[in-house]
């Protein structure tokens, strides 16, 4: 799986990556004017893991398991 | 205050079994994924088991897949190492590690001061 | 498996100085490296995660860089507590490895 990941928040992400067999998805999360892009696990793909991965407490976030999916538009969706 | 306590630490004969407990408080145990990691008297660290925050995935190297099992309980904030068909490679200074660091898997931010494991005839 | 190789394997420096320590992935790990620091008779402490971030409460004097296979640790300044050991570790997926360790040693 390919996702879009970026070691800190950034606005734009570009960076692609070839995520390791045990990641099966791809995230992308807005919490205020933060924006986190990563290679995900599915199981995690819920409120109370990303909140507490991340340290957010409000935030909105897309999960999905198909190559570079993680991009910003799909929040705007 | 973030604290994790290993026990049931011991010598055991080669073949023999053992069953490693880590307590865990100060924290939200159940929304952390936890690995066990362990350091051989070479002073090498080697993870040996990880498990995801609902238990429902775990992942071991090769050299003790089949042989050790993480189990976790949520309810009692505590993790589980089971070994077995132990061997003289397996003595070292077991940890138990809180694992996902901010946004990342696989990184170790809060570590046991560890349980000492003796593999010996 | 992702084979993790540091060096050296000890090092012996002053108060003050500056030292670099490396790290080498077998292969492309992009920014996922961990640094830990492990002083006599203690659990490791995380240093560094991401290549370069540094973990809460570590002092700016450590600095992580690199990407892809190549990385380093650089400690400024060194002082007293510096001294122990240190550790680069993968985090790019399982099996996760450790590189064997560097000593870092008052002269």
């Known amino acids: 799986l390919q996702c879009y990941n970026c070691p800190n928040p950034t606005a734009d992400c570009k960076t692609a990556v070839n995520c390791s067999s045990d990641f099966d998805a791809c995230l992308i999360t807005k919490a205020g004017l933060q924006v986190y892009n990563k290679c995900w696990k599915f199981e995690h793909c819920n409120f109370n893991d990303v909140t507490t991965r991340l340290r957010e407490n409000e935030l909105t976030y897309y999960c999905c398991k198909k190559d570079l999916c993680n991009f910003n538009e799909q929040l705007e969706n | 205050e973030v604290q994790l306590v290993e026990s049931g630490g011991g010598l055991v004969k080669p073949g023999g079994s053992l069953k490693l407990s880590c307590a865990a408080s100060?924290?939200?145990?159940?929304?952390?994924?936890m690995s066990w990691v362990r350091q051989t008297p070479k002073k090498r660290l080697e993870w040996v088991a990880y498990?995801?925050?609902?238990?429902?995935?775990?992942h071991y190297p090769d050299t003790v897949k089949g042989r050790f099992t993480i189990s976790r309980d949520n309810a009692r904030n505590t993790l589980y190492l089971q070994m077995s068909s132990l061997k003289s490679d397996d003595t070292a200074m077991y940890y138990c590690?809180?694992?996902?660091?901010?946004?990342?898997?696989?990184?170790?931010?809060?570590w046991g001061q560890g349980t000492s494991v003796t593999v010996s005839s | 498996d992702i084979q993790m190789t540091q060096s050296p394997a000890s090092l012996s420096a002053s108060v003050g100085e500056t030292v670099t320590i490396t790290c080498r992935a077998s292969?492309?790990?992009?920014?996922?490296l961990a640094w830990y620091q492990q002083k006599q008779g203690k659990s490791p402490q995380l240093l560094v995660y991401?290549?370069?971030t540094l973990a809460e409460g570590v002092p700016s004097r450590f600095s992580g860089s690199g990407s892809g296979t190549q990385f380093s640790l650089k400690i400024n300044s060194l002082r007293p507590e510096d001294f122990g050991s240190y550790y680069c570790?993968?985090?790019?997926?399982?099996?996760?490895?450790f590189g064997a360790g560097t000593k870092l040693e008052l002269r």
């Open positions: 498990i995801s925050s609902g238990g429902g995935s775990t």
């Open positions: 100060g924290f939200a145990f159940s929304s952390y994924d």
């Open positions: 991401n290549a370069k």
């Open positions: 590690a809180r694992d996902g660091y901010y946004a990342e898997y696989y990184v170790m931010d809060y």
């Open positions: 570790q993968h985090h790019y997926g399982s099996p996760l490895t």
């Open positions: 292969e492309n790990i992009y920014s996922y």
